[in-house]
Interface confidence: low
């Protein structure tokens, strides 16, 4: 039974980082959704990934601190440093749920976590880096226009004293380490992949029952190379990550190859096009697409077809599928365990046959050896006497790859901010190198296109100013 | 070309019962949030019913709840509202209406169809 | 129930004028959840702005949204003569799910 004023919540602030929000969502929808997917996302996130994401997620929400009410946007004047814990503390003006779980999206979820909903605000897991404070990576809130008011007020007047959204919420929320237990979230709720646990009997021990894992550090997930053929994560020059950060990106890619990537395929020509009533790419802003004469937002086909992705013959609108490739099959797994109501189609890749694919779903002539689900892969993190194993009518069935063809489409990687670069043995996600001129730069910037993570980050403007200054 | 068009409107008596289409062309229906909204000179534009892009989510006004049922097929790009025990107060034009990404706006609507309840 | 309160009832103006409509909210509305709609006689409401302030495919920028949460403003910079119309605010909440105001009517003066 889904409950509909209650809802997982995660923001994605480029097409980068919706890749994540795309594994968590379908991570999510995996063990047995009851709630709502929310993203929240900023107006940099490219048209195709927002359709991309709507087959996900219940509902795509933009969030634009240029645009919004005064009080949010003077407060993103006074602390521009802060534009992305702004844009994360939005999550509390969702009015219209009365509780949510807030997931960053280099979250992963192993297995239901609807118990989070019997929490009261603000609950969380204790940082492991100082437990006293709280991970803002995994939180139990209660929307409210008045809370996010005080929050914002409490930006405008304190900071943040790590410069992000965790200092902020740790202040604002300061009495979380002393008050009510029931606050803290166990650390399984929240387990950081990649810290090499100085307890490690405690790993061994409680490791396996983890629920969620984080992916804490600069190395996301997407900055990791996989092989699809022998299902293992490519290191990455000197970074190492231990054995079980291996098994938890493992499980990333994983969800990624089987239950992300087709919904790459199955996104047709029209839609990534055609939305009435509203722009893709923020026409009222003075976006880079122009607003067509039918009234159609069009997808920013400002950047040439990146060198890593070969570009193919032929054209996005094609209705024929590739010339010597199979005719587009249809994968519905109907044993999968879905919440009331919703179709598997809507995850698994591939479009009903009587809507031509743009993409064709093309079965690799050599399947990957690798476990396709969860269950085998887990394994690793699982003891066998576990209470709490996945049903198998819950467990993904095998999809078909995504061909190295899928993502060669000139348009359909113009639609996108990041290069997707697919081949039998590598699956690699970069973000797309564009340079913009200074004029660019400039009314990116008027029209609140901020990239807070990337080069846009506080501490890349303070360098430039103090090179300036010097 | 964008369209939504209603249709199975007409004049019932109070009791009965009337099922309304919705057809969709011209955009990709899946992604869409749909909506029944009516419009009546006493009360002006009154939501009705939602039902989310994939089927999972449904909502009905207080107004309507237990006696109407929203439902879609993406297959055919068809949207549905079943109406029972129609009362006098449900006279109205009945619109349907689509947001993409989100629902909580209505990008798309529909030309309407009227349903008309008396003895 | 958020009740939607829409001012004035009527407003008569000539062409080229500039056209000030409120919304005012029972209680506090996420900006992110306020969109307007033109209806002309005959026809099915139209979508203008949403989130308050972003205009809708389409819409000549003579039309503009703001305002934050319980006082909203749609503002028509120059009237032309196919605005003359009804206006609708609506918002997006949890009971019920949609709200509509009772509408301003433009007429031609």
């Known amino acids: 039974m889904s409950v509909t004023d209650q809802a997982f919540v995660t923001l994605a602030t480029n097409d980068i980082y919706c890749q994540g929000a795309l594994v968590l969502g379908q991570s999510l929808r995996r063990h047995r959704l009851t709630r709502k997917l929310v993203v929240l996302i900023t107006p940099q996130v490219s048209s195709l990934l927002r359709v991309i994401l709507s087959k996900v997620f219940d509902e795509v929400i933009e969030v634009n601190l240029i645009d919004s009410a005064d009080y949010i946007h003077l407060a993103f004047l006074k602390r521009p440093e802060l534009g992305l814990t702004l844009t994360k503390l939005h999550c509390w003006t969702l009015t219209h749920y009365s509780k949510c779980v807030f997931l960053d999206a280099d979250t992963l979820v192993l297995s239901n976590v609807d118990e989070l909903f019997d929490r009261g605000e603000f609950s969380a897991a204790p940082d492991p880096g100082w437990p006293d404070c709280f991970n803002s990576g995994v939180f139990v809130f209660q929307p409210s226009l008045h809370t996010h008011k005080l929050l914002l007020q409490h930006a405008m007047e304190h900071g943040s004293f790590d410069g992000a959204d965790q200092g902020l919420l740790n202040s604002f929320f300061r009495n979380w380490s002393t008050t009510d237990i029931h606050k803290h979230l166990p650390f399984i709720y929240n387990l950081s992949s990649n810290t090499m646990y100085t307890y490690s009997p405690a790993f061994k021990q409680f490791g396996s029952s983890a629920k969620v894992v984080h992916f804490l550090g600069s190395m996301k997930p997407w900055n990791y190379k996989y092989n699809p053929q022998s299902g293992s994560v490519l290191e990455q020059g000197s970074v190492s990550s231990s054995q079980h950060q291996a098994a938890f990106l493992h499980l990333w890619w994983t969800v990624y190859q089987n239950n992300v990537l087709p919904l790459y395929k199955s996104v047709q020509a029209g839609e990534a096009r055609a939305s009435p009533g509203h722009t893709l790419c923020r026409s009222d802003v003075g976006g880079p697409c122009a607003d067509s004469a039918s009234g159609v937002g069009e997808p920013c086909e400002n950047s040439t077809p990146s060198a890593g992705v070969p570009c193919a013959n032929s054209p996005l609108g094609s209705n024929q599928p590739a010339q010597g490739l199979p005719e587009p099959t249809q994968i519905v797994d109907e044993t999968l365990s879905l919440p009331e109501g919703r179709r598997s189609e809507d995850m698994i890749a591939c479009p009903e046959t009587e809507t031509p694919a743009v993409i064709t779903c093309d079965p690799l002539s050599q399947p990957s050896p690798q476990p396709a689900d969860f269950t085998e892969t887990e394994t690793i993190l699982q003891p066998a006497n576990k209470v709490e194993s996945v049903s198998s009518e819950e467990t993904f069935e095998p999809s078909q790859e995504l061909p190295a063809e899928a993502l060669r489409d000139p348009s359909l990687q113009d639609a996108l901010e990041v290069d997707l670069a697919v081949s039998v043995s590598q699956i690699s996600i970069e973000e797309k190198v564009k340079e913009l001129s200074p004029e660019e730069e400039r009314r990116k910037w008027e029209e609140g296109r901020i990239d807070y993570m990337g080069k846009d980050a506080f501490a890349r403007i303070q360098e430039k100013l103090d090179r300036f200054l010097q | 070309v964008v369209q939504l068009g209603e249709s199975g409107g007409g004049l019932v008596k109070p009791g009965g019962s009337l099922r309304l289409s919705c057809a969709a062309s011209?955009?990709?229906?899946?992604?869409?949030?749909m909506n029944w909204v009516r419009q009546s000179p006493e009360k002006g534009l009154e939501w009705v019913s939602y039902i989310s892009s994939s089927g999972t989510y449904i909502d009905y006004a207080d107004s309507v709840r237990g006696r109407f049922t929203i439902s879609r097929d993406n297959a055919k790009n068809s949207l549905y509202l079943q109406m029972n025990i129609l009362r006098p107060d449900d006279t109205a034009v009945y619109y349907c209406?689509?947001?993409?990404?989100?629902?909580?706006?209505?990008?798309?609507w529909g030309k309407g169809t009227t349903v008309t309840v008396s003895s | 129930e958020v009740v939607l309160t829409q001012s004035p009832g009527t407003l008569s103006l000539s062409p080229g004028e500039r056209a000030t409509l409120s919304c005012r909210a029972s209680?506090?509305?996420?900006?992110?959840?306020l969109a307007w709609y033109q209806q002309k006689l005959g026809q099915a409401p139209r979508l203008l702005i949403y989130?308050?302030?972003s205009r809708a495919t389409g819409i000549p920028d003579r039309f503009s949204g703001s305002g934050s949460g319980t006082d909203f403003t749609l503002t028509i910079s120059r009237l032309e003569a196919e605005d003359f119309a009804v206006y609708y605010c609506?918002?997006?909440?949890?009971?019920?799910?949609?709200?509509f105001g009772q509408g301003t009517k433009v007429e031609i003066r």
């Open positions: 011209g955009f990709t229906f899946s992604s869409y949030h």
């Open positions: 209406s689509g947001g993409y990404y989100s629902s909580s706006h209505m990008d798309v």
């Open positions: 989130g308050a302030s």
């Open positions: 209680q506090s509305v996420s900006s992110n959840y």
């Open positions: 609506q918002q997006y909440g949890s009971s019920p799910r949609y709200t």
